[in-house]
């Protein structure tokens, strides 16, 4: 015998209180597959979360973060405070990058400036709290009679991680 519940499509549930007929999901709930005996309650985007995609009878709501915050974790499970470029988030809030480190994004940690000498190059543009150093040609390339220097690549623009 076929399970009568298997005929219930997504967006409905097999209602034991009504002789296993297919009932529509109650408000603010959904079933994304057929044959379900309950509908799942929709995620509520509250607090620092805001609704990115409304719940429907067949799919859950999706959240992102209110301005000044960014998503962390799969499915935007948490919202973390944004900081300015040149800062990182600590337990005590946003703090400026220490000398010798930089952060060119509104999230993440301060990273050490590139050590140009490790690649045998010189510092063309000094680093700041917001930007990495720009390494230029090696000191040997700057000796008299050396071939012309290719202009350095511009410093990276702030990255935008996918949410």
């Amino acid at each position: 015998l076929q399970d009568p519940c298997s005929n219930c499509p997504a967006g409905t549930f097999c209602d034991n209180n009504r002789n296993q007929i297919c009932s529509p999901c109650p408000p603010n709930s959904f079933s994304s597959a057929g044959g379900q005996r309950t509908c799942d309650i929709c995620r509520q985007c509250k607090g620092v979360f805001r609704t990115r995609k409304e719940c429907s009878s067949t799919s859950n709501a999706e959240c992102d973060c209110t301005p000044g915050f960014h998503c962390l974790g799969a499915g935007c499970s948490m919202c973390e405070q944004d900081c300015k470029q040149g800062q990182e988030l600590t337990k005590k809030g946003c703090k400026d990058c220490c000398f010798g480190t930089f952060n060119d994004q509104k999230r993440g940690i301060c990273r050490p400036w590139t050590n140009c000498s490790l690649d045998g190059k010189s510092v063309l543009v000094n680093g700041t709290k917001e930007r990495d150093v720009v390494c230029g040609p090696s000191p040997a390339d700057l000796s008299p009679g050396a071939s012309s220097v290719t202009p350095p690549a511009p410093a990276r623009e702030p990255g935008h991680s996918p949410q």
């Epitope: 408000p27 603010n28 309950t38 799942d40 309650i41 929709c42 995620r43 509520q44 985007c45 509250k46 607090g47 609704t51 859950n60 962390l72 974790g73 799969a74 499915g75 499970s77 948490m78």
Partner: antibody, heavy 118, light 112 residues
Framework: QVQLQESGPGLVKPSETLSLTCTVS????????WSWIRQPPGKGLEWIGY???????NYNPSLKSRVTISVDTSKNQFSLKLSSVTAADTAVYYC????????????WGQGTLVTVSS | EIVMTQSPLSLPVTPGEPASISCRSS???????????LDWYLQKPGQSPQLLIY???NRASGVPDRFSGSGSGTDFTLKISRVEAEDVGVYYC?????????FGQGTKLEIK
């Protein structure tokens, strides 16, 4: 349908660490939040904390210094550790699926009684 | 944290008669999205709690329609239109607006 099953020692000595595991069957742990809730004998319900499958956690401030919740998606399990237990931690411990990160516990385990005693 | 207060704590009811449980929160549970973030649970003797009502007034799928939730802001009510023997147990309201979610003390419904 989603089912949750708690497992772990029923007796823990004072000052030791309580460790419980919740196994999720009939659905993937890789969505939703997953909570631990406890109920001392004859008393009401207290939320302990939740974890999202990606590892994000949130704990009740009253227990935060003693609680760790972790997840193992490969085993479809999440776990509770509560350190430095006392007799006041004696309770039935429930795991539950949390629809919104601190709201609407739609699916519950059957609960497991943990007694703290020497 | 938000404090939840239920009344009465004990509720003897005759089968077939209606029953009503009150729940009050220490701050409004009405969020800007228009929903009241309040749940009702029933814990039958020897069992885990089960969700009856979410967002103040929405019956969870599979919950008999004799159960209804109402109210807004800080004052909420769970009504059972006709109590049946299987409805005995402890009823809890829970606020789901802020973490930590917090429960009321519980209302024990018993059959007269």
């Amino acid at each position: 349908q989603v089912q949750l099953q708690e497992s772990g020692p029923g007796l823990v000595k004072p000052s030791e660490t309580l460790s419980l595991t919740c196994t999720v069957s009939g659905g993937s742990i890789s969505s939703y939040y997953w909570s631990w809730i406890r109920q001392p004998p004859g008393k009401g319900l207290e939320w302990i904390g939740y974890i999202y499958y990606s590892g994000s956690t949130n704990y009740n401030p009253s227990l935060k210094s003693r609680v760790t919740i972790s997840v193992d998606t490969s085993k479809n399990q999440f776990s509770l550790k509560l350190s430095s237990v006392t007799a006041a931690d004696t309770a039935v411990y429930y795991c539950a699926r949390d629809q919104s990160g601190g709201g609407s516990f739609q699916h519950w385990g059957q609960g497991t009684l943990v007694t703290v005693s020497s | 944290e938000i404090v939840m207060t239920q009344s009465p704590l004990s509720l003897p009811v005759t089968p077939g008669e209606p029953a009503s449980i009150s729940c009050r929160s220490s701050q409004s549970l009405l969020y800007s999205n228009g929903y009241n973030h309040l749940d009702w649970y029933l814990q039958k003797p020897g069992q885990s709690p089960q969700l009856l009502i979410y967002l103040g007034s929405n019956r969870a799928s599979g919950v008999p329609d004799r159960f209804s939730g109402s109210g807004s802001g800080t004052d909420f009510t769970l009504k059972i239109s006709r109590v049946e023997a299987e409805d005995v147990g402890v009823y809890y309201c829970m606020q789901a607006l802020q973490t930590p979610p917090t429960f009321g003390q519980g209302t024990k419904l018993e059959i007269k």
